[in-house]
């Protein structure tokens, strides 16, 4: 067991998940904990419980290991940290990491007011609705590190986007969610298309039908639980 | 299955796995207490890397057998708080040198056998 004395501790290591933070339902998932060379031991903890451990081969690179998810469920979604030791001493803790676990109960339809396409600096609204109650959804972009939104909502929710700009376009997907890290099937990609201004250009994003598991977020938390891009996302309003 | 040993005795427990992927399997030992949660008791590695819990350390080993497809957990010095169902539970695949301590690591279990040590 760790024993961690607050004079003497080693750097906090770095944690982080592939091929995403989020993972279907089933899947499987691979969490990084990188410490350092003289590293003898890593240890995983899962919601403040010890979840696995590893002890580095000298022959191996010792100043990271793979800690694997066989099978993603709901008991495996939630926050993660790691710690490593060398010698007789413990790192400090490693920042939390949250999985969120997909592919839950029910798919959420999708649509976009007043239409998909639009010209610059009209003002957009994003629904998600989902039969199964839930207490919160989630409007995700595709390749949009950050670019996340959540709002409260029983069966249906809203997303205003204000007046668009050519950062607004791309396809987006929402949710509903059980708890934070526990979120339906996603729905149906809904690409937004901006035309006017300037190039008065409608490009859609490269590869719109991009697979989850190569879709680029980073669920760090706010008091929310989850952290927005404030430049872009600002609607914290709660029903 | 019902294992029933004396205060002080020992017991191996074991647990044969069907299919093809037990070597890259990591496999543990927990156990439930009548009125207690399920808890860790022992776990091994696909490379043979062994952790124990702190109540068991020293009285219980676990190792493998992977040409028998098999986890042993070889329980001495019973004492009557050791007694519980014992369960076996793998992780299938796995990586490396990973050992889970956590339940919810595991994706599949055995039907459990219950030891009861007499005082």
């Known amino acids: 067991q760790r024993i961690n004395t607050e004079k003497e501790t080693l750097p906090k290591p770095i944690i982080w998940a592939k091929p995403s933070i989020m993972v279907t339902n089933g899947n499987s998932v691979n969490i990084w904990c990188q410490g350092a060379q003289s590293a003898s031991e890593y240890q995983l903890y899962f919601e403040g419980s010890f979840f696995a451990l590893e002890r580095p081969k000298p022959s191996r690179s010792m100043n990271k290991v793979r800690f694997f998810i066989s099978q993603m469920t709901s008991h495996t979604a939630g926050i993660y940290t790691c710690f490593y030791q060398s010698g007789e001493l413990w790192s400090k803790s490693s920042n939390p990491l949250k999985l969120v676990v997909t592919g839950l109960y029910d798919t959420p339809n999708l649509w976009v007011y007043p239409r998909p396409e639009v010209t610059l600096g009209e003002n957009v609204t994003f629904f998600c609705q989902l039969k199964t109650a839930t207490s919160k959804f989630f409007l995700l972009k595709e390749r949009g590190s950050n670019h996340i939104q959540n709002k409260y909502g029983n069966i249906q929710a809203e997303f205003p986007m204000g007046p668009v700009t050519r950062a607004h376009r791309g396809t987006y997907r929402c949710f509903g969610s059980y708890n934070d890290y526990a979120w339906s099937f996603p729905s149906e990609p809904v690409t937004l298309l901006i035309t006017g201004g300037v190039e008065n250009s409608s490009l859609a994003p490269t590869d719109p039908t991009s697979s989850l598991d190569y879709w680029e977020f980073d669920l760090s938390t706010n008091e929310s639980g989850l952290q927005k891009d404030s430049a872009f996302w600002d609607h914290t309003t709660q029903n | 299955e019902v294992q029933l040993v004396e205060s002080g005795g020992s017991l191996r427990l074991s647990c044969a796995a069907s299919?093809?992927?037990?070597?890259?399997?990591?496999m543990g030992w927990f156990r439930q207490a009548p009125g207690k949660e399920r808890e860790f008791v022992a776990a091994?590695?696909?490379?043979?890397?062994?952790y124990y819990a702190d109540s068991v350390k020293g009285r219980f080993t676990i190792s493998r057998d992977n040409a028998k497809n098999t986890v042993y957990l070889q329980m001495s010095s019973l004492r009557a708080e050791d007694t519980a169902v014992y369960y076996c539970?793998?992780?299938?695949?796995?990586?490396?040198?990973?050992?889970?301590?956590?339940?919810?690591?595991?994706?599949?279990w055995g039907q459990g056998t219950l030891v009861t040590v007499k005082p």
């Open positions: 299919g093809r992927t037990f070597a890259s399997a990591a």
């Open positions: 091994i590695s696909r490379s043979d890397d062994t």
């Open positions: 539970a793998a992780v299938v695949p796995t990586y490396g040198n990973n050992i889970y301590v956590h339940s919810a690591a595991y994706n599949y």
